[in-house]
Amino acid sequence: MRTEAQVPALQPPEPGLEGAMGHRTLVLPWVLLTLCVTAGTPEVWVQVRMEATELSSFTIRCGFLGSGSISLVTVSWGGPNGAGGTTLAVLHPERGIRQWAPARQARWETQSSISLILEGSGASSPCANTTFCCKFASFPEGSWEACGSLPPSSDPGLSAPPTPAPILRADLAGILGVSGVLLFGCVYLLHLLRRHKHRPAPRLQPSRTSPQAPRARAWAPSQASQAALHVPYATINTSCRPATLDTAHPHGGPSWWASLPTHAAHRPQGPAAWASTPIPARGSFVSVENGLYAQAGERPPHTGPGLTLFPDPRGPRAMEGPLGVR
């Protein structure tokens, strides 16, 4: 989960630590500590909605809550792209939009969110249990993917609340880049604190956050591999696979989204922030690239409330996405 920067409140230094050396040894650790605490990780949210007018028509919206620049978005269904999922659309911020039936209209809504209308396969909606996944490749974070589906009993015209899915995957490029620096900083911080442990440390005031505010945590490979063992399997019913249609796809068009209640206290991300709610929707999934799924909101045992990242087994090149897109 992405967390808002929580800058620790510092008490004045104790007498006797006021010298130049004292200042230098104090400032650096607290800057590093702030970095470690505030190191928010990106987040992808997914919203799936069945249109009231056409019961077999779906609209998927996805957004990326992160500071990096998005290099590619891939929307798939039936599971993550490349793990049995079928690509519905690929959106590149500068190179354009590609989509395949039953996708009818893919578009950028903002610089960090996209929407996709799917045309249904019949009068009724056999696709209500289909899982839709959005993968955002970004720099420097790497690739992040979240999946969602309609809640089983959703009424037409209503949508599952956007799923602020903690994404259990990131490419090595992003992890080694950002997390490596942070990890090094945190280790260095501990080293400094140990060196100066004979000195009384400034007291930290506990930051006031709401009960559901997620805590930041530094990434460690051991945590990731441990968590991987505990991700439960879930069966995904992808019985609905409309026949492939050869259609031309118009772009652009009106925005059909009414404002939802805003739960953006910890997501100061501009236009897309309203679409992120801390309450996971029933039927929405968090995906893991190796084919495992965890129900959103159910945390793997022993991993705590923080985010656990899984490096992409394909290595740094995996963030390139569809071929030729660098």
């Epitope: 079928t86 354009g96 809504e109 772009h251 569809p322």
Partner: antibody
Amino acid sequence: EVQLQQSGPELVKPGASVKISCKASGNTFTDYYINWVKQSHGKSLEWIGDIEPNNGGTNYNQKFKGKATLTVDKSSSTAYMELRSLTSEDSAIYYCATLYFDYWGQGTTLTVSS
Amino acid sequence: DIVMTQSPSSLSVSAGEKVTMSCKSSQSLLNSGNQKNYLAWYQQKPGQPPKLLIYGASTRESGVPDRFTGSGSGTDFTLTISSVQAEDLAVYYCQNDHSYPFTFGSGTKLEIK
């Protein structure tokens, strides 16, 4: 290094069909979304269609519907374009290219002549 | 379909000169959601497949010399070669990357005097 290797030149008779191949290498094949482009002699480029490799979803330029059929074979990392009911108008160089046209095959020259 | 119109159809310049070619689209190629123009430029040398030079109207593909510059927005776009080299002899195409079907301009043939 990404490579798209196309099949060799074809000389066919009017009314016949031909199947051109484009073998992709250098990455996972399911990352290849293939476009097909026609270039008539000394003329501009025309987009024929594209294909998504996971389940073969396609888009066609209306002009080439009924003329071209795009398929993929994931096991051999190869995309195919079949052209049918050939006429002299179909004589051209046909290129395959990746999703955003940043890698191209070397082209397949098709000559339709009796 | 979006029609792409290029001008001039050909031009002849001496090495070292600056050259500008134009591309106009029948519909806007600006994506309102992210304010990006979906237009690409390609260079095709004799006997070779096209090569991507510019995408997003102004972003150079990696490995493309910085003498190639793309500009423009909406329906009017320009490709500029700041100092033409002998190896730039080619046909240059613009392409609608905005919506299906993807359409190309008729090309501008660059000849070196």
